[in-house]
């Protein structure tokens, strides 16, 4: 039960997380106009990975998309492509933990390819969450060296007459968002890697040996496992363990409304 | 056809206070900003306050600040300026405009008269 | 504040003939994101509200007759009539769109020579 807590909490967590990626690699408040110190302007700009925008005061926002491939900063194209290998990764991971899922059935899939997938959708998680949290810090850091650097500027080449405002960008939504965003795919990455060791089979496996009594039936496991005694007319023995193994009566598996084929 | 109609405008006392109304129509005025120019006889303009569309943000000249209230009914397509501590130089024509493109005043009232006079 | 300085003061010109006015302002109205120019040209006659002619320093107004031009990027502007009309003679005010507060020029009154 707890494991499959740990499995469901995971996913529902790297889902939010992943949505985050998506949402703060769209958004165009990567860095906006720093007011602070600033003479107040009827005209904000702010800036995405894909597009730069002005908004107005009276309300007009316009905004051009960076149409050139090779005339961006190097850094900004980094950051773009951590976020994409983020979104793939996480997507991929996505997909690769609903089959992975305890609670859904998919014919007679075993529970050590369970915990394999859980594992391989874990460490997806990890990895996308560590690309979001790398392309955001990569783009906070480009954004803090040139503010110190325009804010040098400003206090420098004064002496004219006609001042020039040198216009500073701070952090905007979009980066908050993806740090929170790369940190809940981290964490259910890890919840992920938690939950698969749980699923994972013992070392040694027993076949369990049914023997069939009339009036109720008792199934056995060598090596001191725990015994499961079923009475009434039902003949059909209890899993008690299933480690790969399964007794004859077993193999079917009976449809549940949990179940996805 | 858009329309801008001021009203409110009179005589009034140094220290009186005075509210002006602009009456907006034929454009969508919740998602418009407003603003209050006005301009003293035989004078140049005087950009006096903005309001923002969503009544967000409020901007002031300094020679009106913390006299003087811009504030807006979207309810009721008007715009309001409310004039406290008035003074001699406050004596304008004063007239409602809207923000359009490039913060630009696109549409003017025809402006209400305010005499401040003892 | 931002300063803007209008010039001339006053403009005498004969009908048909070409008009300049110029407008400086003390920090630069070009906003980067965009590359545009936030500064506005109105037109004012006797007894009128002011009317809108130019804005982001060379966009006309829809309705505006096109012997009106507007020009100039950062701090320095000019406003060109190009063949003036008898309805042109006016004051003509420059006003800065970038920063608040919305400064305006003084103003530059065309008059008939």
């Known amino acids: 039960m707890a494991v499959t807590a740990c499995q469901g909490l995971g996913f529902v967590v790297s889902l939010i997380g992943i949505a985050g990626i998506i949402a703060a690699t769209c958004m165009d408040q990567w860095s906006t106009q720093d007011l602070y110190n600033n003479p107040v302007t009827a005209v904000f700009n702010y800036q995405g990975l894909w597009r730069s925008c002005v908004r107005e005061s009276s309300g007009f926002t316009e905004c051009r998309g960076y149409f050139t491939l090779l005339g961006l900063p190097a850094m900004l194209q980094a950051v773009r492509a951590l976020m994409i290998v983020g979104i793939v990764l996480g997507a991929i991971g996505l997909l690769v933990s609903i089959f992975a899922l305890k609670c859904i059935r998919i014919g007679s899939m075993e529970d050590s390819a369970k915990a394999n997938m859980t594992l391989t959708s874990g460490i997806m998680f990890i990895v996308s969450g560590l690309c979001a949290i790398a392309g955001v810090s990569v783009f906070a850091n480009m954004l803090v060296t040139n503010f110190w650097m325009s804010t040098a500027n400003m206090y420098t080449g004064m002496g004219g007459m006609v001042q020039t405002v040198q216009t500073r960008y701070t952090f905007g939504a979009a980066l908050f968002v993806g740090w929170v965003a790369g940190g809940l795919t981290l964490i259910g990455g890890v919840m992920m890697c938690i939950a698969c060791r749980g699923l994972a089979p013992e070392e040694t496996n027993y076949k369990a040996v049914s023997y069939h009594a009339s009036g109720h039936s008792v199934a056995y496991k060598p090596g001191g496992f725990k015994a499961s005694t079923g009475f009434g007319s039902n003949t059909k023995n209890k899993k008690i363990y299933d480690g790969g193994a399964r007794t004859e009566d077993e193999v079917q598996s009976y449809p549940s409304k949990h179940d996805y084929v | 056809e858009v329309q801008l109609v001021e009203s409110g405008g009179g005589l009034v006392k140094p220290g009186g206070s005075l509210r002006l109304s602009c009456a907006a129509s034929g454009f969508s005025f919740s998602n418009s900003a407003m603003s209050w120019v006005r301009q003293a006889p035989g004078k140049g303009l005087e950009w006096v306050s903005t309001?923002?569309?969503?009544?967000?943000?409020?901007y002031y000249a300094d020679s009106v600040k913390g006299r003087f209230t811009i504030s807006r009914d979207n309810a009721k397509n008007s715009l309001y300026l409310q004039m406290n501590s008035l003074r001699a130089e406050d004596t304008a024509v004063y007239y409602c405009a809207r923000q359009g493109y490039g913060n630009a005043l696109d549409y003017w009232g025809q402006g209400t008269l305010v005499t401040v006079s003892s | 504040d931002i300063v803007m300085t209008q010039s001339p003061d006053s403009l005498a010109v004969s009908l048909g003939e070409r008009a300049t006015i110029n407008c400086k302002s003390s920090?630069?109205?070009?906003?980067?994101?965009?590359?545009?120019?936030?500064l506005t040209w109105y037109q004012q006659k006797p007894g009128q509200p002011p009317k809108l002619l130019i804005y982001?320093?060379?966009t006309r107004e829809s309705g505006v007759p096109d012997r009106f031009s507007g020009s100039g990027s950062g701090t320095d502007f000019t406003l060109t009539i190009s063949s003036l009309q008898a309805e042109d003679f006016a004051v003509y005010y420059c006003?800065?769109?970038?920063?608040?507060?919305?400064?305006f020029g003084g103003g530059t009154k065309v008059e008939i020579k």
């Open positions: 920090q630069s109205l070009l906003q980067s994101g965009n590359n545009k120019n936030y």
């Open positions: 982001w320093s060379s």
């Open positions: 006003q800065n769109d970038y920063y608040y507060p919305l400064t």
């Open positions: 309001i923002s569309s969503g009544d967000s943000y409020t």
